[in-house]
Amino acid sequence: VCSRDFTPPTVKILQSSCDGGGHFPPTIQLLCLVSGYTPGTINITWLEDGQVMDVDLSTASTTQEGELASTQSELTLSQKHWLSDRTYTCQVTYQGHTFEDSTKKCADSNPRGVSAYLSRPSPFDLFIRKSPTITCLVVDLAPSKGTVNLTWSRASGKPVNHSTRKEEKQRNGTLTVTSTLPVGTRDWIEGETYQCRVTHPHLPRALMRSTTKTSGPRAAPEVYAFATPEWPGSRDKRTLACLIQNFMPEDISVQWLHNEVQLPDARHSTTQPRKTKGSGFFVFSRLEVTRAEWEQKDEFICRAVHEAASPSQTVQRAVSVNPELDVCVEEAEGEAPW
Amino acid sequence: VCSRDFTPPTVKILQSSCDGGGHFPPTIQLLCLVSGYTPGTINITWLEDGQVMDVDLSTASTTQEGELASTQSELTLSQKHWLSDRTYTCQVTYQGHTFEDSTKKCADSNPRGVSAYLSRPSPFDLFIRKSPTITCLVVDLAPSKGTVNLTWSRASGKPVNHSTRKEEKQRNGTLTVTSTLPVGTRDWIEGETYQCRVTHPHLPRALMRSTTKTSGPRAAPEVYAFATPEWPGSRDKRTLACLIQNFMPEDISVQWLHNEVQLPDARHSTTQPRKTKGSGFFVFSRLEVTRAEWEQKDEFICRAVHEAASPSQTVQRAVSVNPELDVCVEEAEGEAPW
């Protein structure tokens, strides 16, 4: 605590500004204004990331206005140093006390590298499991933004369920944060809009994302399944392919079944929906099967879950590794696909 | 030009700095320093994006040092205004002349949202056209006065060919810059490494990307082609599907041919290579064909161009919309796929 017989200084750093195009000048001046103190000896030190800098302080100038004094000290930095994100501190010692102000290059204000995405529920979760969830995904965060806040709301103003949060470091040195919110099947189908608001002290403005049931025309998927013939050198393995196309909207879930049991998602690889030449979408799904599986039961089912499929939001197609001859003839003659 | 009987002012804007964590303060002060002029009447006006601002200038203070005067005028802005990327100008009228300095928020300096990618030549360009090119792609640039520089080099130190450059403004307001470099077929096949160096005034460090022929094991693609059966309501259209799999490395070109003529790439949709459960990759390609096409000639060819395919780096597979019965039987009996 300062004793009463002197007025302590205020320490404030000003900096040279960028030009009218927002470009950094080749050198950056930091001006340390030490103002409003009772005249007396003051000591100014500049620190870079906490380390004392070797700076010529003979340029510091002191002026007196009435009973109070002010001192200015200038530090010149190369653009490269300034852009390297170091912290600069002007430390003032006066009457045995220390006063300081610190600065660094302003954090990038445009969250260009920070993106937020809000998914819709998968048709499988919505129509089969009947426990739909939506996920708010925030990517390209720095580790210090791990405390990013994701808050949920509904356009109707009704309360939201409890959400679960996950944090993951990506291989490119960025952070991904997800928040998953369970939604009511009926609420979703009836067109409720859900909002995810992303805030963090370093983000100049909140990122808002909203999601609701897709509007527009509906079309049920066509499902076709194929088996590859035997390939030299791989007698005990075959690939099954499923083409699902001309569906609208693009939300779809694809499953493979064998022996009336759904195979784990990790077993197959399904592409992202892509636009057809018309107005619909298509996906391909690929499943590798073993001789043991097809010898146990040579029927595999590719199933699409989609809101426009009737009666139960699913369309499926069976395929065999070794189809009977008559099946082949039938299809060659252009019979209906099921 | 100023007459000799007065010294004109220097106009310089300083700004309040961000704190030691790089955070913007709630309000930003711009300080216009008008210094070193022969005492006389001066008029200070602040402009925002070229428009005169309604600012209380009574706070401007003038001091005299020896024979020259200095004046300071302060403008306080909300963080929101400052972050909205407007340009602020301190305009000084003195002895019938105008002197000014402009500033705006410094452009984001961290290339957080800036990514650079360097492609390898497509197998089609490399093996069929024999005129391979590589492309350096820089995305998520903020449009600004500083131009992005893409320079090419070879690890061997040998000279590079002349490159072509393209700039494209994306709908999200960012800039994409590409530079395409022709490379020697032999140089590439023999393992030359090419580097693309991306520099820009706003990037604190150059982005470097290098590319060379992929190392590791090789495997030729398996190619399978299928036609969908007729679907109710679309008698005059069919979809052909091509599954190309178990190839290594992942670089592949896919083409469709009809009547010995290659169809334009825009006609088909081919997925990005994805990993199989083993060590190889797979792609799917989808082509919509019309009755007019299959009635003219009912044979369509799916061709893969890949470095491991022999003898001529291509593997192809024919498919018909209405296959003859014997073709179908043959395949059902598990004959070799071609």
Epitope: R171 | S115, Y117, L118
Partner: antibody, heavy 119, light 111 residues
Framework: QVQLQQSGAELAKPGASVMLSCKAS????????MHWVKQRPGQDLEWIGY????????EYNQKFKDKATLTADESSNTAYIELSSLTSDDSAVYYC????????????WGQGTLVTVSA | DIVLTQSPASLAVSLGQRATISCKAS??????????MNWYHQKPGQPPKLLIY???NLDSGIPARFSGSGSGTDFTLNIHPVEEEDAATYYC?????????FGGGTKLEIK
């Protein structure tokens, strides 16, 4: 300048636990991931795991999941690794290393702490 | 886990000559246009020091006689011309997949 100052050498008995520290200075501690790496005498380097000091979120190499516990204290700019149920296989030099945002490498390392496990 | 195999295990090179160290990965360390391979060297009693990141980028302050190349599974570190101070153990590191792994090291001796 950036510095990662690690605590001194430890001699521990089999079955015991040790806590090693890594004090960061010269930069904003919570802006970077802190990783730990093990190096047995005359052997190669093994990645143990990392912590995000801001959130305390950790990821481990499965091999060290039951061996190491990573923590961080933002107020003292210090990261810690606790090694439990020590055996002679845990005798090694342990390094802390800093990973930056958008970087997937270690530009800064601590000087290392030698842990010797002996009866 | 991705296994990195370095060769040779040790290497003796005359002053001013070229040293070449190879690192082979058990699977590709490329992802989405980037290569997640780094090189470090380590002198006795010291921590490793970053030389090259992302396969071919020289870290600041590292002399230009060091260079890295490669993509996918095969990578090379070259030092030319070799100087006395380059005597050290060299490690490659992949950061494409958890757990991050290091090569077994190559000990460089100057003749």
């Amino acid at each position: 300048q950036v510095q990662l100052q690690q605590s001194g050498a430890e001699l521990a008995k089999p079955g015991a636990s040790v806590m090693l520290s890594c004090k960061a200075s010269g930069y904003t501690f919570n802006g970077y991931w802190m990783h730990w790496v093990k190096q047995r005498p005359g052997q190669d380097l093994e990645w143990i795991g990392y912590i995000n000091p801001t959130t305390g979120h950790t990821e481990y190499n499965q091999k060290f999941k039951d061996k190491a516990t990573l923590t961080a204290d933002e107020s003292s700019n210090t990261a810690y690794i606790e090694l439990s149920s020590l055996t002679s296989d845990d005798s090694a030099v342990y390094y802390c290393a800093r990973q930056e945002y958008r970087h997937s490498w270690f530009a800064y390392w601590g000087q290392g702490t030698l842990v010797t496990v002996s009866a | 886990d991705i296994v990195l195999t370095q060769s040779p295990a040790s290497l003796a090179v005359s002053l001013g000559q070229r040293a070449t160290i190879s690192c082979k990965a058990s699977q590709s360390v490329d992802y989405d246009g980037d290569t997640y391979m780094n090189w470090y060297h380590q002198k006795p009693g010291q921590p490793p020091k970053l030389l090259i990141y992302a396969a071919s980028n020289l870290d600041s302050g590292i002399p230009a006689r060091f260079s890295g190349s490669g993509s996918g599974t095969d990578f090379t570190l070259n030092i030319h011309p070799v100087e006395e101070e380059d005597a050290a153990t060299y490690y490659c590191q992949q950061t494409n997949e958890d757990p991050w792994t290091f090569g077994g090291g190559t000990k460089l001796e100057i003749k």
